[in-house]
Amino acid sequence: SAGAGSHCQKTSLRVNFEDIGWDSWIIAPKEYEAYECKGGCFFPLADDVTPTKHAIVQTLVHLKFPTKVGKACCVPTKLSPISVLYKDDMGVPTLKYHYEGMSVAECGCR
Amino acid sequence: SAGAGSHCQKTSLRVNFEDIGWDSWIIAPKEYEAYECKGGCFFPLADDVTPTKHAIVQTLVHLKFPTKVGKACCVPTKLSPISVLYKDDMGVPTLKYHYEGMSVAECGCR
């Protein structure tokens, strides 16, 4: 898996809803692939991490003053929805096809 | 200034274009306020860091498995433009009124 020594990339992160206490309201799925953005944002920032101008500037300032300014951070830049079956306020199972922002689609340096 | 022990927030970062080698093409300004997003994304994630569902999930998984999964990261979530005067290939000064993504407007946990 990608550590701090490798460049920013999307890695697997299986999330079990019981582990995070969400099994009290999410009926299904029991777990899902959330993914995680891992790795460093090293100079020079590659196109595949879609850096903003600010991220490029911060990377250059970090090169010059590494103790004063941090590197840009590897984070989700695009998220995908999942479908979930959950209990509503009255305990009725309800299907939400598009439960937004639950899974990483793309990672980048920000 | 905000360190890793404080919560995610926008802090000052004055960038001098000479320091990053951009003075070769940016005539003015000589420096600008880029800001930096600093601090941790701690549980529970506050509304002011506008967490995505994925960031909330990752924070909860980190609580459960701190060595396996990292915390969400404090990054710019909204950027502002600045106006820059730059030299073109012929050395002619040209103005970019709306040079996007150069300064942090808002920070959040992603």
Partner: antibody, heavy 114, light 110 residues
Framework: EVQLVESGGGLVKPGGSLRLSCAAS????????MSWVRQAPGKGLEWVGR??????????DYAAPVKGRFTISRDDSKNTLYLQMNSLKTEDTAVYYC?????WGQGTLVTVSS | QSVLTQPPSASGTPGQRVTISCSVT????????VHWYQQLPGTAPKLLFF??YRPSGVSDRFSGSKSGTSASLAIVGLQSEDEGYYYC???????????FGGGTKLTVLG
């Protein structure tokens, strides 16, 4: 020497159309973000819109009063900037300048009147 | 009503120092990006000052400063050829382009 020369102005009836041109020389036109700025008779300056360089997407942005009626385009092979003005109103009467922000043309007068 | 407020007129005698102010009254405008244009009678506007950059051909009698939400243009050793209109301009983030002040007509007396 940088030169911007506008042309195409004239008298047009309300609801009519006009296309302005701006011939550029003395700088790398293809890399420049180009704007149109107008000045109504006896009034101040008003930004009309801007086009980025093609290498930066060639995106256009417009001021609210002209959005949907005016279109900015560029032909880098001819070093020329254009402003297509449709559905003209009397309040569009002005001298229209093309500019890099640092350099300005001499302007061309557009009069919208019946 | 312009979001950059200038006095409609200013005057002075030859050799005097004149200051023209430009006040920001809109949060979409950052005073940092404010700059100045000169328009002499019957001519196109000309960039006078952008941050600390003065285009070649512009006299060093012109200088710009910024404080709080105001920018100022100072002209020392006033000359009859300085007569004309002076416009401040800023970057309107919402509009994604420049916005101009209403202009100040400078008259050189005597």
């Amino acid at each position: 020497e940088v030169q911007l020369v506008e042309s195409g102005g004239g008298l047009v009836k309300p609801g009519g159309s006009l296309r302005l041109s701006c011939a550029a020389s003395g700088f790398t036109f293809s890399n420049a973000w180009m704007s149109w700025v107008r000045q109504a008779p006896g009034k101040g300056l008003e930004w009309v819109g801007r086009i980025k360089s093609k290498t930066e997407g060639g995106d256009t942005d417009y001021a609210a009063p002209v959005k949907g009626r005016f279109t900015i385009s560029r032909d880098d092979s001819k070093n020329t900037l254009y402003l297509q003005m449709n559905s003209l109103k009397t309040e569009d009467t002005a001298v229209y300048y093309c500019t890099t922000g640092t350099y300005w043309g001499q302007g061309t007068l557009v009069t919208v009147s019946s | 009503q312009s979001v950059l407020t200038q006095p409609p007129s200013a005057s002075g005698t030859p050799g005097q120092r004149v200051t023209i102010s430009c006040s920001v009254t809109n949060t979409d405008i950052d005073i940092f990006n404010v700059h100045w244009y000169q328009q002499l009678p019957g001519t196109a506007p000309k960039l006078l000052f952008f941050h600390d950059y003065r285009p070649s051909g512009v006299s060093d009698r012109f200088s710009g400063s910024k404080s709080g939400t105001s920018a100022s243009l100072a002209i020392v050793g006033l000359q009859s050829e300085d007569e004309g209109y002076y416009y401040c301009a800023g970057l309107d983030e919402a509009m994604r382009g420049p916005v101009f002040g209403g202009g100040t007509k400078l008259t050189v007396l005597g």
